[in-house]
Each structure stands twice: as structure tokens, then as C-alpha cells.
């Protein structure tokens, strides 16, 4: 559902986007996640900030927490407990990293309209939830973990060794939490509640990233984060399970690690319950190419949890890494044994395999030259996952459903029919039993969210649809977008093309190359956005392109794993390649070409700079890798093995962005980073620099003092504006 | 504590009218679904009607034997609920009770009843 | 509206016993269901919720079950303080039917 394109008579009323229209967030959309609460029942704060039950079979909605009460504590957010007789209500909101913050927790007793008093929550917590039945209460709270039978109850501590930067209980380090779980909590709640369990990870001998936070003090405070970097000594994890019923009884029981893991270095990757009494863990080695799936039984004997070896499932990859960016986690079937899980096939493509008994015995219940992605939910009868099979475009995402009670497997697309020009790419949110579900499509049409039944997949009503944007949009002249494929030597290159808006191929356009090329990620996506890149071709007329070269996601493993120990080699050769393409369709000028690329996307873009291609003009790196040697373990590992003599530290050296200083000096490059980036730190760009000084290459620098991976906030401003002037001087565009 | 108290019964001749009052405490009267339900005397539960939140619309539902005659209101800022009874029949006689309808769709919370007798 | 069919009426029993009563909507509530106690001269007191949730504070020698039009209140072992009037009710749409009770008495 893009605006309608209009004839010339028409176009004097219509304007291009405007930077200011980008970094005001003037076009930005909204969608509609219900907070599932039942089968049936769903909450959603309403836009006077009313917290509103909707029960979808009833059609009632009740106001269940008013927005005096959320406003009397601040609250910036809240959870039911399951009994539905209390809120926590959460305030303070701290940001640590990605996923973790601290906040102050009230709970409110919805029956009687009071807060509770007595016992209160220590602050700040750096975690809390309610258990899945019941008003029980979990929470960490200085690295340690503490459990509450009721809100009102004191609370009974868990866990005693919890230190700062040393032990962490509950919750991630800083690696695990970025690298591995992708949550800010490590605890995880049985499914009635009777066991929790929780991981521990020992950072004592993690070397430690030290950097200035300046803010306004007389001397600047040290940030110090146990930070493992590639090869160095990593956290020790462990995972215990305790009885919340009688916690003091035997207290918290340990897991045992599978042997063929714990012969040498290791993590933890998932914990998944499957009864009360039957839990999934997850292992990797190290060396990231085998994951081990365990599954272990409670002892009621002897209060213990048994893991036998007979229910051990060893998945190995022998052309790559395990897994996708992470390892795959089982969805379990109503048996509470036999899983379903997504792996690669035999012809390197992942796919939906169940496993009842062992691995080589899976049954395969997708397959074909595409990939599943993402499995929603299982019910008794129905699958429902996430896949890029419909019309053979990878960047597309549509949901299916496999009935799984009869034989053969029946599949239909739920999505692939619904707006076919506005919806491609869909994820969803089902409600307990796949009673309903909502459908929220990312484009590329404008945004819509929408409730379905979960037996005939009927719409039953739209969630959102975006209205006052489609609106807004009516008199912009938005760029034309285009998704294509090169074939180039048995590689397909996807790539979507941005075009301004008046687009004639009979002209020449300057080409801005937009980057990440990280693997298993994907760029070339059927999503809609209106941001900077929509920006400089809407006004600036800039084709803009991206392009999924080897390494990235989701067209099988021979693409995946092509960057398999060689990181920085071939994704810098398909953007070269790409653009060599684009400069033969002839409306390129190929005078004026730049890359720029954020992350992983700044290393990209610093090496195709420095390729000594002369392709292009100028580049931007923003907060880029330098060095693989720099960056987190868990992550550059996976990728690139060890750097050691023995393993792969030839290609760490080789791969470096300083390795090339003397090519930068044909091009105009702008090297961007936050000081108080605790992700890809300061350091990465900091040795470039250096290298560029040593080698006595001229190039431009911006920092952003105390600002970290995001650079967020008034620094978005400065950037993109920055980054703006940038690009028109190197195209030599007017201001 | 929840406490649901009941008051404005008493004798009333047919055709006649009477408002009934409950005032309430110990809970967000305001984000509360009120119901009235009556008792025949020696008979069973009859549900009258409820009045949701203002925040969900305030709106009103009634069985069909009170339907046209009765009004169900509510005054948030005294915490109390009114049943305004109208056209009044013998066989309205019963003890009224108040209650409070628990967005876990329970009549969680009742008061101690009033009174109400219909009679020439 | 929903007509909710209680059963039986009334049901004599003795201390100790195992008691059952059934309760039948005239379409089906899923599990929009409640069952309430009363003693005479006091208000109802509710029991279960939802089917077969048990209301907190009620003794767990109640149980409910049932969903969609049938549903069942059983008492494993009968007390002397159990023996009351019990009702059904629905609660999935208005109006919020109550069954015309089962009286439970001493044998």
C-alpha cells in the first residue's frame, strides 16, 4: 500500500522527503503485538495509557489498571501475574547494554486497588517475573536471585555469591547476554511453576575492556566490563534448578554437562522446559560447529536431575558453524519428548526435521530450495512457521501451517493471499493454544497488524493499519524500490534498489552502496521504511542499493558458509561485483560512488574502500570492526575459529582494516565511532586511525563522546547530518 | 478490605418507585463492572443488570423482566453504585445485592443485601 | 439468552460423602462458568471460577469441571459447614444467567 503515483499535473503538490522528516521520525509506523494473557484474552495499553483487557470471544474489553495509577509511580511498564490478582508496575528504567536495564518494581494489587506494603522490592532489580501459574516472584538483585511465594511475603534468597562483574546469577554477562541468549535474564521458570532454573556465570578470569565515560565530572569515571575477546579466557557457566515449593529443602540443584561438552571449553546456549518435571538444555563447544540437545529428567528420589545419554542429540555441522546466527531451539510436542526443531538438510538448506527418538532418525517436515526460518507455535493438530519459499524472493516472510495430526502433512499458506502487493514479509504472536493469532506485516506496503482465528484463519478485525501515515504519505514523493537478482559465477546476489522518485534510466545517478554483509544476516528485505536512504533518493537523487552477497542468511548454506574462517574476503567481493553490475545498466555514474555501512557493515565498507578497485569515491564506517581480534569471542569464533598459530591466526591478520591503510589513499573516508561503545569498542577505530596517521593517509573522523553502539538520542541528529554533508560534497551535490 | 454495602430498601406500594444505594471501599470502585442481583424470598439468584467503568464506556445491560423500568448509575466520586426502580411490581419483591463483577468474569464481592418489598 | 439448567434441585447427603452436582447451558460458554455457595440469610460466596479454578480460600475439597455447555461441582468429602445452596452462573454474555440452584441438606 504505497501512495498511488500520481500524474505530472499533480506532482507541483507534492514535495520530497526532507532529513528533517527522517531524524523527527515523521513517517515512522506503528504495530500491534497483543500481551497474550490466556486463549482468548489479550492486554494492550490503550492511547490514553488505560491498561485494557480485550477478550476477543466475549468482544469485552475491561479496564484493568487505570493510567492515574500507572502515572502515580511513573511506570513505564507492567506484567500480570497469572492469577490475575496482581501488576508489577516498573519505573527507573536504567539501560545497561542491548537488552539489560535496571528499574524500580511496585506491585499493585488489582483486587483491592492498593499497593502492596510490607517486603517491599529492593532497588533496583535487574530482573523480575512472575512464574507462569500463581503470583510467585522472581527477581535478581545485585547479581543474586531471590524468590517470593506472594508480593506480599519476604523474600527467600536463592543465590549468595553473586558479585558485580564476577558472578552473575539470573542474568547474562556481558558476552552471553550479546552473543548467545540474546535476553537480559537467565532464569526460567518451570511450566506451573514448581522448578526454576537459572545459569551462573563465573567471569573471575575474563579479561576486562576498560574506557573513560567523561560526563560532566572533574575526571572522567572507567567503564570496566569483563569482555571476553577472541581467544581469551571465557565465563564459566553452570545451571541449577530449584524446587520454589520447598526452596530451603535441598536448594539449588546443578545440571549435569553433557560428557563429549564439558571435555573442553564450552557454553550454555538455551534452556527450555518441557514438563515440571522435564527440562531441554542446550550446549555448544568452542569451537562452534557442535551443539549438544539434552534432555533431563527430575529424580524424585533422590531430589537430582538425570540427563542420560540416551536422550543426548548431537547436532554437528561439517561445512560451517552450528546453526544459523545462533543454534536452533526444539519445540516440543504434546508427547513431551519428540521435538521439532530446524536444521540443515542434507542438501544444506534449513528445515523443519522432527526428531522422536535420535537426530539421524529425523523426519524431514519441510524441504525444498528454500528455508524455513521460524516456528511460531505447535498445537495437537497444526505446525505454524515462518519461511521464504512463496515465489523464490529470500527477503520475504510468510506464514504457514502444516497440519500435523493427519498423514500426509497438509500445508497451507495463511499469509501469501492476505494484501499480496502490501504484505510479504509477516511475523506473528499466537495466543495459548493457537486459540487466535495476530499477523503483523512489515511491508513492503505500509505496515498493518491484523487478528486472525486460529482454527479457519479468518481476519477478525484489524489491530492497526496505519492510517494517519498512509496520510501523511499521500502528498511525498517517495523513491521507486526495487528487489532483484544478479547471477554472477553460480552466485545469486539479491539486491533491492532505491531509485528517486522521477527515476530515467536515460541518466546518470551517483550510487550509494548501504552495507552490513555480517553472516547470517540479511539486508535485501520486502520491508517498508522511510529513512535516510529513502531520504537521498527522495530529495537528493541518490540510487541507493543493498546487496546480500556470500555469507548472509537464508538461501542455503553454500551462501552461508562461504565465509566460513575467511571473514572480510568474499563480502567485500560481492559488493564490488554488484556494483560492477550496476555500472552496466548503464544509469550509474560511475564517477561518483560511495559505500557506507554501520558495525559490521563499517568493516565492509573500510575494506571495499581500500580494495584498490578505484570504484569508489568515498565511504563512511560507522563504528566499525577493525580487527577480528578485537571483537567478542562468542561471536568472532563462530565465525573465524581461534587466533592461534595452530587454527586461524593468519586470516585474523590478513583480515584487518590497518593491513590497508595505504589504499585509503585514493579515497575520502569518514570514520565514525562512539567513545563509550561497549560492543565493537573505540579501540576498532582507534587503531585505524592510528594506522591511517602512521601511513600518512589524510581521511575525516567524527566521535561521539560517551555514546555507545547505537549512538542514540541528539547524536542521530549530528550523524545523519554529518554523514549528509559528507555524501553531497563527495557527490558534489549543492547544500 | 472489600466491603459492598447496600441501603434504600424498605416497603413500596406498586407502581411505586425506589432508589437503591451501595457504597463502596477497598477497592477502585471507578475501574469496577457493578452488578445488581436480586432473591425472591425462598427462590434463587437473579441476575438484574451491571454498569461497566466509565473507562470502558459506562454503558448499561438488563435482564428483560427489569428492562425499561430500572436504571442502574454510578457516582464514582462517592464510590457508589444506584439502582433506580421504577413501575415497581409485586413481583420485584426480593433482597437486592450488589456486587462486583471481577474481570475474571466472577461476581467476586457482594454486599449483605437489602430488602425490597413490593405491596398494596 | 443462556438458560442455565441446574441438577438436582435439591440433594440429601451425609458427612463424609462425595457429591456431584451438574449444571447444563443452553449454548455453549466455553468455560464462562462459576459456581457460588449461600447459606441462608447471607450473601453468595463464590467457589469456583472459571470452570475449575478454585476461588483462593475455598477448601480443596471443591472441584469444578466442564466446558463448552456441561459442567460438574463435586465435593470429595462433604463437611458439615457444606451444607448450603449451591448456583451456576454464566458469565459469557449478559445477561449473566444464574441455574435455580441445587440445595444440598443433611441426610
Known amino acids: 500500500l504505497r501512495p498511488p503515483r500520481v500524474h505530472n499535473s499533480e506532482e507541483n503538490t507534492m514535495r520530497a522527503l526532507t532529513l528533517k522528516d527522517i531524524l523527527n521520525g515523521t513517517f515512522s509506523y506503528k504495530t500491534f503485538f497483543p500481551n497474550w494473557i490466556s486463549g482468548q484474552e489479550y492486554l494492550h495499553q490503550s492511547a490514553d495509557n488505560n491498561i485494557v483487557l480485550y477478550n476477543i470471544e466475549t468482544g469485552q474489553s475491561y479496564t484493568i489498571l487505570s493510567n492515574r495509577t500507572m502515572k502515580s509511580v511513573n511506570a513505564s511498564n507492567y506484567g500480570l501475574s497469572p492469577d490475575r490478582q496482581f501488576v508489577y508496575l516498573e519505573s527507573d528504567y536504567s539501560k545497561l547494554w542491548r537488552y539489560s536495564y535496571t528499574a524500580t518494581y511496585y506491585i499493585y494489587d488489582l483486587s483491592n486497588g492498593e499497593f502492596v506494603r510490607g517486603n517491599e522490592l529492593p532497588r533496583p532489580i535487574q530482573y523480575l517475573c512472575w512464574s507462569p501459574v500463581g503470583s510467585k516472584l522472581a527477581y535478581v538483585y545485585q547479581n543474586n536471585i531471590y524468590l517470593k511465594q506472594r508480593p506480599g511475603d519476604p523474600p527467600f534468597q536463592i543465590t549468595f555469591n553473586g558479585r558485580e562483574n564476577k558472578i552473575f546469577n539470573g542474568i547474562p554477562d556481558w558476552v552471553y547476554e550479546e552473543e548467545m541468549l540474546a535476553t537480559k535474564y537467565a532464569l526460567w521458570w518451570s511450566p506451573n511453576g514448581k522448578f526454576l532454573a537459572y545459569a551462573e556465570f563465573n567471569d573471575t578470569d575474563i579479561p576486562v575492556i576498560a574506557y573513560s565515560y567523561y560526563g560532566d565530572e572533574q575526571y572522567p569515571r572507567t567503564i570496566n566490563i569483563p569482555y571476553p575477546k577472541a581467544g581469551a579466557k571465557n565465563p564459566f557457566v553452570r545451571i541449577f534448578i530449584i524446587d520454589t515449593t520447598y526452596p530451603a529443602y535441598v536448594g539449588p540443584q546443578e545440571v549435569p554437562v553433557p560428557a563429549m561438552i564439558a571435555s573442553s571449553d564450552y557454553y550454555f546456549s538455551w534452556l527450555t522446559w518441557v514438563t515440571d518435571e522435564r527440562v531441554c538444555l542446550q550446549w555448544l563447544k568452542r569451537v562452534q560447529n557442535v551443539s549438544v540437545l539434552s534432555i533431563c529428567d527430575f529424580r524424585e528420589d533422590w531430589q537430582t536431575w538425570d540427563c542420560p545419554k540416551t536422550q543426548e542429540h548431537i547436532e554437528e555441522s561439517r561445512t560451517g558453524w552450528a546453526g544459523g546466527f545462533f543454534v536452533s531451539t526444539p519445540v516440543f510436542s504434546y508427547d513431551a519428548i519428540s521435538y521439532y526443531k530446524i536444521f540443515s538438510d542434507k542438501d544444506g538448506y534449513k528445515h523443519i526435521h522432527y526428531i522422536k527418538d535420535t537426530v539421524e532418525n529425523a523426519i524431514q517436515i519441510t524441504s525444498g530450495k528454500w528455508e524455513a526460518i521460524n516456528i511460531f507455535r505447535v498445537t495437537q493438530d497444526s505446525l505454524f512457521y515462518s519461511s521464504n519459499e512463496f515465489e523464490d524472493y529470500p527477503g520475504r516472510r510468510n506464514i504457514y501451517r502444516i497440519s500435523i495430526g493427519s498423514y500426509p502433512p497438509s500445508k497451507k499458506c495463511v499469509t501469501c493471499h492476505l494484501r499480496k502487493e502490501r504484505c510479504q514479509y509477516y511475523t506473528a504472536s499466537f495466543s495459548d493454544y493457537a486459540k487466535y493469532y495476530a499477523l503483523v506485516c512489515y511491508g513492503p506496503g505500509i505496515p498493518i497488524s491484523t487478528l486472525h482465528d486460529g482454527r479457519t484463519d479468518q481476519e477478525i478485525k484489524i489491530l492497526e493499519e496505519n492510517k494517519e501515515l498512509e496520510n501523511a504519505l499521500k502528498n511525498i514523493q517517495l523513491p521507486k524500490e526495487e528487489i532483484k537478482k544478479l547471477e554472477v559465477d553460480e552466485i545469486t546476489l539479491w539486491y533491492k534498489m532505491i531509485l528517486p522518485p522521477q527515476f530515467d534510466r536515460s541518466k546518470k545517478y551517483p550510487l550509494l552502496i548501504q552495507v552490513y554483509g555480517g553472516p547470517c544476516s540479511q539486508s535485501v528485505r520486502s520491508v517498508f521504511a522511510v529513512n535516510w536512504i529513502s531520504y537521498l533518493a527522495s530529495k537528493e537523487g541518490m540510487v541507493i542499493a543493498l546487496v546480500d552477497g556470500r555469507g548472509t542468511a537464508f538461501q542455503g548454506d553454500k551462501l552461508l558458509y562461504a565465509v566460513y574462517r575467511k571473514l572480510g574476503v568474499y563480502e567485500v567481493e560481492d559488493q564490488i561485483t554488484a556494483v560492477r553490475k550496476f555500472i552496466e545498466m548503464g544509469f550509474i555514474d560511475e564517477k561518483r560512488i560511495a559505500i557506507w555501512g554501520w558495525s559490521y557493515g563499517g568493516y565492509v565498507s573500510s575494506l571495499a574502500l581500500a580494495s584498490g578497485t578505484g570504484l569508489f569515491k568515498c565511504g563512511i564506517a560507522v563504528a566499525p570492526v577493525s580487527s577480528w581480534e578485537y571483537y567478542a569471542s562468542v561471536y568472532t569464533e563462530r565465525f573465524m575459529g581461534l587466533p592461534t598459530k595452530d587454527d586461524n591466526l593468519e586470516h585474523y591478520k590478513n583480515s584487518t582494516v590497518m593491513a590497508r591503510a595505504e589504499y585509503f589513499r585514493n579515497v575520502d573516508y569518514l570514520l565514525i565511532h562512539g567513545t563509550a561503545d561497549d560492543n565493537v569498542h573505540f579501540q576498532n577505530s582507534a587503531q585505524i586511525a592510528k594506522a591511517l596517521v602512521n601511513a600518512q593517509v589524510d581521511f575525516q573522523a567524527m566521535w561521539y563522546s560517551d555514546q555507545n553502539h547505537g549512538l542514540s538520542g541528539l547524536s542521530t541528529n549530528h550523524l545523519y547530518t554529518h554523514m549528509t554533508h559528507f555524501l553531497k560534497q563527495c557527490f558534489s551535490l549543492s547544500d | 478490605e472489600v466491603q459492598l454495602v447496600e441501603s434504600g430498601g424498605g416497603l413500596v406500594k406498586p407502581g411505586g418507585s425506589l432508589r437503591l444505594s451501595c457504597v463502596a471501599s477497598?477497592?477502585?470502585?471507578?475501574?469496577?463492572?457493578m452488578n445488581w442481583v436480586r432473591q425472591a424470598p425462598g427462590k434463587g439468584l437473579e441476575w438484574v443488570g451491571h454498569?461497566?467503568?466509565?473507562?470502558?464506556?459506562?454503558?448499561?445491560d438488563y435482564a428483560a423482566p427489569v428492562k425499561g423500568r430500572f436504571t442502574i448509575s454510578r457516582d464514582d466520586s462517592k464510590n457508589t453504585l444506584y439502582l433506580h426502580m421504577n413501575s415497581l411490581k409485586t413481583e420485584d419483591t426480593a433482597v437486592y445485592f450488589c456486587?462486583?463483577?471481577?474481570?475474571?468474569?466472577?461476581?467476586?464481592?457482594w454486599g449483605q443485601g437489602t430488602l425490597v418489598t413490593v405491596s398494596s | 439468552d443462556i438458560q442455565m439448567t441446574q441438577s438436582p434441585s435439591s440433594l440429601s447427603a451425609s458427612v463424609g460423602d462425595r457429591v456431584t452436582i451438574t449444571c447444563r447451558a443452553s449454548?455453549?460458554?466455553?468455560?464462562?462458568f462459576n459456581w457460588y455457595q449461600q447459606k441462608p440469610g447471607k450473601a453468595p460466596k463464590l467457589l469456583i471460577y472459571?470452570?475449575?479454578g478454585l476461588q483462593s480460600g475455598v477448601p480443596s475439597r471443591f472441584s469444578g469441571s466442564g466446558s463448552g455447555t456441561d459442567f460438574t461441582l463435586t465435593i470429595s468429602s462433604l463437611q458439615p459447614e457444606d451444607f448450603a445452596t449451591y448456583y451456576c452462573?454464566?458469565?459469557?454474555?449478559?445477561?449473566?444467567?444464574f441455574g435455580q440452584g441445587t440445595n444440598l441438606e443433611i441426610k
Open positions: 449454548q455453549s460458554i466455553n468455560s464462562y
Open positions: 452462573q454464566q458469565s459469557y454474555s449478559p445477561p449473566y444467567t
Open positions: 454498569i461497566k467503568s466509565r473507562a470502558d464506556g459506562g454503558s448499561t
Open positions: 477497598g477497592f477502585t470502585f471507578s475501574l469496577a463492572w
Open positions: 472459571a470452570a475449575s
Open positions: 456486587s462486583r463483577f471481577y474481570w475474571n468474569y466472577v461476581l467476586d464481592y
